[in-house]
């Protein structure tokens, strides 16, 4: 008896991180024997959508003409052949940016830093959030994020880097997000250029501890009341 049908491949074009209002196409590729393709979205009634295969029957297209909050989430696809349904594909996480206003990203004490010294990148959001993501352009592992362990919402998160080396130099942006859906991100912050001077080299730089700060009282939009180390935010490299 033949083993289970091989799982299909699931991907999104132009990518899996889509700005609000932009179009995205989800592709599911199975085998030439496929008769039907099904796309399931986590926490949605299954199936989320069904499509007939496109010739030569080894893939199907699921179109999202205008990205909104409702489409953000985790997807899997299956195909049906004469012998039954396939295994599920690996999940595709479709993320929407533009769900909230852009945070602001600062470098303290300055974006000009000497190799071997310390710098902290500070990401601040307009409304309280529980996840902050730091992105470095053209990095092999660009995503670093701080997430509140207790659902405590913060207006800002700090990403300290020490000691700084030339590898830390580059262009950074940050995003913020709410715990109720990590598939919904803010607009990206304006870019911040971190310039490292000096010649100390360290091939494996890593940020140190994280710090989050609650916002001040209502009449002071972003004058924090004080820094609390860690404060419920947990660091993840992704």
């Amino acid at each position: 008896q033949a083993g289970p049908l091989p799982k299909p491949t699931l991907w999104a074009e132009p990518g899996s991180v889509i700005s609000w209002g932009n179009s995205v196409t989800i592709w599911c590729q199975g085998t030439l024997e496929a008769r039907e393709y099904r796309l399931d979205k986590e926490e949605s009634p299954a199936p989320w959508d069904r499509q007939n295969p496109l010739e030569p029957k080894n893939k199907a297209r699921f179109s999202i003409p205008s990205m909104t909050e409702d489409y953000a989430g985790r997807y899997r696809c299956y195909y049906r052949s004469p012998v039954g349904w396939s295994q599920p594909s690996d999940p595709l996480e479709l993320v929407m940016t533009g769900a909230y206003s852009k945070p602001t990203l600062s470098a303290l004490p300055s974006p000009l830093v000497t190799s071997g010294k310390s710098v902290t990148l500070l990401c601040q959001s307009r409304s309280p959030m529980d996840t902050f993501l730091l992105i470095k352009e053209r990095a092999a592992h660009p995503l670093l994020h701080l997430r509140s362990e207790h659902g405590a919402q913060q207006h800002q998160a700090e990403f300290p880097m020490s000691p700084v080396t030339s590898v830390h130099g580059g262009t950074y942006r940050c995003f913020s997000s709410h715990g109720f859906s990590h598939y919904l991100l803010s607009h990206p912050s304006d870019p911040l250029e971190l310039i490292v001077s000096g010649s100390l080299e360290d091939p494996r730089p890593s940020p140190t501890r994280s710090v989050s700060t609650a916002a001040g009282p209502e009449d002071q939009p972003l004058m924090p009341t004080g820094s609390v180390p860690h404060s419920g935010l947990r660091r993840h490299w992704e």
């Epitope: 909050e69 769900a99 600062s106 004490p109 307009r126 409304s127 700060t213 009449d219 972003l222 004058m223």
Partner: antibody, heavy 117, light 113 residues
């Protein structure tokens, strides 16, 4: 394209109330604060308050507290501001504006409210 | 409340010349948390809504011509138009967003000489 489209001009008598609407489109409505700003004829800009559509949270300038009420209808992506106990000095253009980070990156076209007996 | 005071109230500048508008706040707008100044500049043409030009005192909004520049820190800020164009005739406002209530300057009317 982000757009904030406001309701038309209103003429009201002193003591009456007026309700101005601001319909948002072209962005994720729930995640952005909407503020209201007053501009009397030939004068400057005065901040009235904000509403956060996601939660309905509001905050008002003390000067307008008790007379201004902001509400939201998420099903139509519309924010409303009601101003009660109108007096002649409430004659102004009222703008809704989308907050970026406490500053305003998009504005409605304005609604003229005239208070006259 | 933070009081924002602009000077001059009105200004007439020849086409192609530099226009300078000043804005003074009654307390510092420089945040110790991020070393940013919580100040924005807007342009309002007759019969139109205001338009954001500058935020964080010196960051130009997308689509704003580079002849507009913001500078200053603490309590003293400047909006400079390096080479005045006919379409720059408008009233210009500064706004502080350091603390509530948000407040604006009284406006500076810019005209062609």
């Amino acid at each position: 394209e982000v757009q904030l489209v406001q309701s038309g001009a209103e003429v009201k008598k002193p003591g009456a109330s007026v309700k101005v609407s601001c319909k948002a489109s072209g962005y994720s409505f729930s995640g952005f604060y909407i503020d209201w700003v007053k501009q009397p004829p030939g004068k400057g800009l005065e901040w009235i308050g904000y509403i956060f559509p996601s939660s309905g949270e509001t905050s008002y300038n003390q000067k307008f507290k008790g007379r201004a009420t902001m509400t939201v209808d998420k099903s139509t992506s519309t924010v409303y501001m009601e101003l009660s106990s109108l007096r002649s000095e409430d004659t102004a253009v009222y703008y809704c504006a989308r907050q970026a980070f406490y500053y305003f990156d998009y504005w409605g076209q304005g609604t003229t409210v005239t208070v006259s007996s | 409340d933070i009081v924002m005071t602009q000077s001059p109230d009105s200004l007439a500048v020849s086409l192609g010349e530099r226009a300078t508008i000043n804005c003074k706040s009654s307390q510092s707008l420089l945040s110790s948390s991020n070393q940013k100044n919580y100040l924005a500049w807007y342009q309002q043409k007759p019969g139109q809504a205001p338009r954001l030009l500058i935020y964080w005192a010196s960051t130009r909004e997308s689509g704003v011509p580079d002849r507009f520049a913001g500078s200053g820190s603490g309590t003293d800020f400047t909006l400079t138009i390096s080479s005045l164009q006919a379409e720059d005739v408008a009233v210009y406002y500064c706004q502080q967003y350091y603390s509530y209530p948000l407040t604006f300057g009284q406006g500076t009317k810019l005209e062609i000489k």
